[in-house]
């Protein structure tokens, strides 16, 4: 066993910064600031749009705003996945895409965002107040889920603005409690900074970190407001539940999907990332491969401390479909 990628730790401010403000007052804002800066990320956004052309057709777009790389995306409706929600699509970078009616086409838009078009007719069609949820699994940080629905007043063809994490369900114990503490901390930090601003500036001993003080003031409000968005999503709409799809006829596909405990499988769209036309599966297995770097001979961005990953703007190389479907 080995750990391939290490997440760079935030460096704490250096010790020995006791000035006229005193140790407690100076260190606390830095601790809180560190917490506030990290509390707001990562985040998931969900955008639900009703198509003007087909009034009962929906497009759901979801994205992950975070530094981690996505290794599984699950889209569900009627509530969060695993909490009464019904899976519509599962997207895996290597093994491909699987979807169930009324999902018409799921696809990767970028390496960290997906879109899903829903069919609009029949008993299983969505209605305007249906809740759609997207869950992004990022390794090894955990999974984050956000839910969204069309605003009651929205006109066809208009989309609800992206909802940044109405539900942030990190699979870490006590995340909500911690978020509450962090939110309080961020507010307290703001209060401290405001109070500090109205006070005559104390003379600090020379310090390498003092130039960062203005940045602290600039960061805090945005992060605090971001943290405020991370509230538990309580009102799951169940007035418009999808019909059971047990009568659907499976059409083969990759065997790894065979026993998913959702409804009977419709024909899988082969991983159609960055492609509008779905690629049908051939034979009993779908051959999929992780599409990594766009140019042959291009060196990969190795994961490691302090590394920023820059995805190729064109996404994975299109070999028989971007993920290698044959």
């Amino acid at each position: 066993m080995r750990t391939e990628a290490q997440v760079p730790a935030l460096q704490p401010p250096e010790p020995g910064l006791e000035g006229a403000m005193g140790h407690r007052t100076l260190v606390l804002p830095w601790v809180l600031l560190t917490l506030c800066v990290t509390a707001g990320t990562p985040e998931v956004w969900v955008q639900v749009r009703m198509e003007a052309t087909e009034l009962s057709s929906f497009t759901i777009r979801c994205g992950f705003l975070g530094s981690g790389s996505i290794s599984l995306v699950t889209v569900s409706w009627g509530g969060p996945n695993g909490a009464g929600g019904t899976t519509l699509a599962v997207l895996h970078p290597e093994r491909g895409i699987r979807q169930w009616a009324p999902a018409r086409q799921a696809r990767w838009e970028t390496q960290s965002s997906i879109s899903l078009i829903l069919e609009g007719s029949g008993a299983s069609s969505p209605c305007a107040n249906t809740t759609f949820c997207c869950k992004f699994a990022s390794f090894p940080e955990g999974s984050w889920e956000a839910c969204g629905s069309l605003p009651p007043s929205s006109d066809p063809g208009l989309s609800a603005p992206p909802t940044p994490a109405p539900i942030l369900r990190a699979d870490l114990a006590g995340i909500l409690g911690v978020s509450g503490v962090l939110l309080f901390g961020c507010v307290y930090l703001l209060h401290l900074l405001r109070r500090h601003k109205h006070r005559p500036a104390p003379r600090l001993q020379p310090s390498r970190t003092s130039p960062q003080a203005p940045r602290a003031r600039a960061w805090a409000p945005s992060q605090a407001s971001q943290a405020a968005l991370h509230v538990p999503y309580a009102t799951i709409n169940t007035s418009c539940r999808p019909a059971t799809l047990d009568t659907a006829h499976p059409h083969g596909g990759p065997s790894w999907w065979a026993s998913l405990p959702t409804h009977a499988a419709h024909r899988p769209q082969g991983p159609a990332a960055w492609a509008s036309t779905p690629i049908p599966a051939r034979g009993s297995f779908v051959s999929v491969e992780n599409g990594l770097y766009a140019q042959a001979g291009e060196r990969p961005p190795h994961t490691g401390p302090g590394l920023t990953l820059f995805p190729d703007p064109r996404g994975p190389r299109a070999m028989e479909g971007p993920l290698g479907v044959r």
Partner: antibody
């Protein structure tokens, strides 16, 4: 820290069954495939199959379809592989492995292996 | 299923020597991955997606190839490189490994 902890060595008799375990820690167990690999002395690596615990989805190498059965217990973050009707051909070290695939990279995490000896 | 044939099965090389291990697939694959295994230890991912070095792998290693023909190369053999190397395809189920190449130091 991501870790896969496998159960201890097993000495079995021909015809019996054995259930190997692989306990995962350090990541969201339900969202990642656990693969099983066989290594016999003097032979190469063989891919047995895989399971996605959160979806109870399995995929087997046809060669091992009647030999291996994968299960998962999400409450204990443990994946199991049961090997049935054991013969001397099943004497091997069995590894559970997590290979994480994203658009950017592969990462691998291996259990320490469980040695199974089938002998009368 | 796709059969991967590695050659040579066993080879020895002197320190500083260039080493090339090949892996031939029975049908075309998109990428090839390579694993290193030393006696008594679990295998380790060594090269992924044909040419990308896994974390911690020395830069003297490289991988190349396409279609049905792939190779792993060590520009200058070192004692710590003595191990068994396996190629693996993940383009078509079931995933398969090559038979392995045991690399020894002279």
């Amino acid at each position: 820290q991501v870790q896969l902890q496998q159960s201890g060595a097993e000495l079995m008799t021909p015809g019996s069954s054995v259930k190997l375990s692989c306990k995962a820690t350090g990541y969201t167990f339900t969202d990642y495939w656990i693969e099983w690999v066989k290594k016999r002395p003097g032979h190469g690596l063989e891919w047995i199959g895989e399971i996605l615990p959160g979806y109870i989805s399995t995929n087997y190498n046809e060669k091992f379809k009647d030999k291996a059965t994968f299960t998962a217990d999400t409450s204990s973050n443990t994946t199991y592989m049961q090997l049935s009707s054991l013969t001397s051909e099943d004497s091997a070290v069995y590894y559970c492995v997590l290979i994480v695939t994203t658009y950017y990279y592969f990462m691998d995490y291996w259990g320490q292996g469980t040695s199974v000896t089938v002998s009368s | 299923q796709i059969v991967l044939t590695q050659s040579p099965a066993i080879m020895s090389a002197s320190p500083g020597e260039k080493v090339t291990i090949t892996c031939s697939a029975s049908s075309s694959v998109t990428y090839m991955h390579w694993f290193q295994q030393k006696p008594g230890t679990s295998p380790k991912l060594w090269i992924y997606s044909t040419s990308n070095l896994a974390s911690g792998v020395p830069v003297r290693f490289s991988g190349s190839g396409s279609g049905t023909s792939y190779s792993l190369t060590i520009s200058r053999m070192e004692a710590e490189d003595a191990a068994t190397y396996y190629c693996q395809q993940r383009s078509s189920y079931p995933w398969t490994f090559g038979g392995g190449t045991k690399l020894e130091i002279k």
